[in-house]
Interface confidence: low
Amino acid sequence: DFGLDCDEHSTESRCCRYPLTVDFEAFGWDWIIAPKRYKANYCSGECEFVFLQKYPHTHLVHQANPRGSAGPCCTPTKMSPINMLYFNGKEQIIYGKIPAMVVDRCGCS
Amino acid sequence: DFGLDCDEHSTESRCCRYPLTVDFEAFGWDWIIAPKRYKANYCSGECEFVFLQKYPHTHLVHQANPRGSAGPCCTPTKMSPINMLYFNGKEQIIYGKIPAMVVDRCGCS
């Protein structure tokens, strides 16, 4: 699997992974104890036909061209978890692995 | 996890899974021995904020609103493989499990 990495200076218009630091304090999410900030990243860009297609299925749907099927879009194709310390709804402190919090790779699907 | 199922009679505008039978013979893909047709399904529809979001990450990116980040799009969130019998480039017959050929569920990511 392959995915492009970009930053805010990139001229790349195609589907790419961009850096993004999520700041829970800035959001006012005070129930999150740690981390206060983390690198989440995000996906953005155009999905030209066949470029960075994760699945053969994407190509097949394009070929079949059913009613209402949009072209593929730039979306996370690989994600990883982070460990977090937070208050749950009962004000108990929880330490747990939260899945799919970091984008590792972007692709067209 | 939850995803909507629709068909061509549905009035649903939101992200939904639709039926699609892929016909390799109709495509002229004569290197595929079996199956000649299979149920692939596809995703289509609008992703209103928070509807069918697969990842908390999607919500966080929306909250952070970085430059160039599009809204989430309707894409497969669960896929399954099928086994296929096909000729490879060297005219050898291969039997193998091809991942992500069937859309089981759609969501916004």
């Epitope: - | 639709y18 047709r37 099928i82 499990k97």
Partner: antibody, heavy 122, light 110 residues
């Protein structure tokens, strides 16, 4: 040998209960959709319900609430629990396996048991 | 729920004749249609799936066609062993919430 064998049929009084079993051999139970279909004497096929690969169950509208499908992977067996039985439930009950189209288990059935007769009568 | 209607109810033909059985769905079912053959005292046997794909071991004289709401099973040259009741079946879109059989067509040999 790949096969399905139903058991548990017999005579039961109206209002009674019965549990049918379907023992599978020669394949992995959880890799396939399993269905129950019945056939009243001299009549057509009538779908009762299925249990899919994930273990989710779906039923014909008339069967909901009275009939329950379950499976025990360790025993390689699928069950049909039938409650509040009526005379019109008299039929041969077939267990069937979803057709495997190269790894994708469909909801049509290519492997059937011989069936077990259930007679509801006082 | 989808309702499947088969016609005719009974058909009596001579060996070698061409047989055409019809199955109509109350709403579009795309290609989600199967055909079964059932002989007395036996369980059904899958003949056709996805409207036109021949199941393993089924003779090539059996042919399925159609999509949407109208489907046909054709036996190009009727053989004595083809005497049976034929059922169509759908699996109700892609939701897997329902399976429906037609009421069957009985094929007799003259």
């Amino acid at each position: 040998e790949v096969q399905l064998v139903e058991s548990g049929g017999g005579l039961v009084q109206p209002g009674g209960s019965l549990r049918l079993s379907c023992a599978v051999s020669g394949f992995t139970l959880s890799h396939y959709v399993k269905g129950w279909v019945r056939q009243a004497p001299g009549k057509g096929l009538e779908w009762i319900g299925i249990i899919n690969i994930e273990g989710e169950t779906y039923y014909a509208s008339w069967a909901k609430g009275r009939f329950t499908i379950s499976r025990d992977n360790s025993k390689n067996t699928v069950y049909l629990q039938m409650n509040s039985l009526r005379a019109e439930d008299t039929a041969v009950y077939f267990c069937a396996r979803g057709h495997d189209n190269f790894g994708y288990s469909y909801h049509d059935f290519n492997l059937w048991g011989q069936g077990t007769l259930v007679t509801v009568s006082s | 729920a989808v309702v499947m209607t088969q016609s005719p109810a009974t058909l009596s033909l001579s060996p070698g004749e061409r047989v055409t059985l019809s199955c109509q769905a109350s709403e579009s079912i795309h290609h989600e249609l199967s055909w079964y053959q059932q002989k007395p005292g036996q369980p059904p046997k899958l003949l056709i799936y996805l409207a036109s794909t021949l199941a393993s071991g089924v003779p090539s004289r059996f042919k399925g066609s159609g999509s949407g709401t109208d489907f046909t099973l054709t036996i190009s040259s009727l053989q004595p062993e083809d005497a049976a009741t034929y059922y169509c079946q759908t699996y109700d879109g892609i939701s897997h919430y329902g399976v429906a059989f037609g009421q069957g067509t009985k094929v007799e040999i003259k």
